[in-house]
């Protein structure tokens, strides 16, 4: 059974992941730039089901494409430093999903824009945090 301290650690990691995802979405929503239109043409795979920490495998597999899209946005008005940001997210995701079990991610048939993708994973984090508190 999970201990109180392990639950607290999980919650903190989820909160950090949530904030990072919110930061990206905010940065993109602030974009009044032709690059935004281009960013929205990139398609992301969405999880068929995302209700447990192991489903973060689906997010992990999309981090490289996410970094590539964010690299497009680099400018003096975009302060997210994609390499550092994605590296931080990757560390959190690896810790949260654990490495004991190998989970094969199942994706939905429909792809999504970066905005839809981020909103989906933000909602995922929020829903898991809600069950922990």
């Amino acid at each position: 059974a999970p201990t109180s301290s392990s639950t607290k650690k999980t919650q903190l990691q989820l909160e950090h992941l949530l904030l990072d995802l919110q930061m990206i979405l905010n940065g993109i929503n602030n974009y009044k730039n032709p690059k935004l239109t281009r960013m929205l043409t990139f398609k992301f795979y969405m999880p068929k089901k995302a209700t447990e920490l192991k489903h973060l495998q689906c997010l992990e597999e999309e981090l490289k494409p996410l970094e590539e899209v964010l690299n497009l946005a680099q400018s003096k008005n975009f302060h997210l430093r994609p390499r550092d940001l994605i590296s931080n997210i990757n560390v959190i995701v690896l810790e949260l999903k654990g490495s004991e079990t190998t989970f094969m991610c199942e994706y939905a048939d429909e792809t999504a824009t970066i905005v839809e993708f981020l909103n989906r994973w933000i909602t995922f984090c929020q829903s898991i945090i809600s069950t922990l508190t």
Partner: antibody, heavy 113, light 107 residues
Framework: QVQLVQSGAEVKKPGASVKVSCKAS????????VHWVRQAPGQGLEWMGI????????SYAQKFQGRVTMTRDTSTSTVYMELSSLRSEDTAVYYC??????WGQGTLVTVSS | DIQMTQSPSSLSASVGDRVTITCRAS??????LAWYQQKPGKAPKLLIY???NLETGVPSRFSGSGSGTDFTLTISSLQPEDFATYYC?????????FGPGTKVDIK
């Protein structure tokens, strides 16, 4: 529990820049993302942005985009908020907040010619 | 951006009164709402987070309820130290946004 101590009051001329510091103590510096919120005299609270102290990357409210820069120095457990091209409407108390529940005491910035 | 509105903007009450402040979000924010108390010249103080969770050290006369778009802060029996301005805040999505505040003063 983390404590936040901010730098002292500043008086600036229009067009100048101001850099407010927020020093953390009492807990792991990187544990909390730091928000900056300001409050003009007699007005409500306005969110300016957030910085991740471990990664050093930040995200800003659209209103301040291009004028605000949030940075951090992990060696001194300090985050900074710099606001440029100051105008009289920027006269306010500027607060840093760790995770939005632990707040600094505030720094009054007065912009006046 | 998510807009937050509060009502009333001010109210006069007496010690011992039950006080209710409402907050409305322009779109659903789940339970991602906090309430703050602010006294003149001081930083805001967190009272309630996640719509109904009482922050450590906050008296139990304060309570919060609601989800989605409609939220309430209740002070069951107003004390002299409760005369202040109260703000709601959503943190469901960035930018974080605050309500305009409700000033509670002495009748």
């Amino acid at each position: 529990q983390v404590q936040l101590v901010q730098s002292g009051a500043e008086v600036k001329k229009p067009g100048a820049s101001v850099k407010v510091s927020c020093k953390a103590s009492g807990d792991t510096f990187t544990r909390y993302y730091v928000h900056w919120v300001r409050q003009a005299p007699g007005q409500g609270l306005e969110w300016m942005g957030i910085i991740n102290p471990s990664g050093g990357y930040a995200s800003y409210a659209q209103k301040f985009q291009g004028r605000v820069t949030m940075t951090r120095d992990t060696s001194t457990s300090t985050v900074y908020m710099e606001l440029s091209s100051l105008r009289s409407e920027d006269t306010a108390v500027y607060y840093c907040a760790a995770g939005l529940f632990i707040w600094g005491q505030g720094t009054l910035v007065t912009v006046s010619s | 951006d998510i807009q937050m509105t509060q009502s009333p903007s001010s109210l006069s009450a007496s010690v011992g009164d039950r006080v209710t402040i409402t907050c409305r979000a322009s779109q659903s924010i789940g339970r991602w709402l906090a309430w703050y108390q602010q006294k003149p010249g001081k930083a805001p103080k967190l009272l309630i987070y996640s719509a109904s969770n009482l922050e450590t050290g906050v008296p139990s006369r304060f309570s919060g309820s609601g989800s989605g778009t409609d939220f309430t802060l209740t002070i069951s029996s107003l004390q002299p130290e409760d005369f202040a301005t109260y703000y709601c805040q959503q943190y469901n999505r960035f930018p974080v946004t605050f309500g305009p505040g409700t000033k509670v003063d002495i009748k």
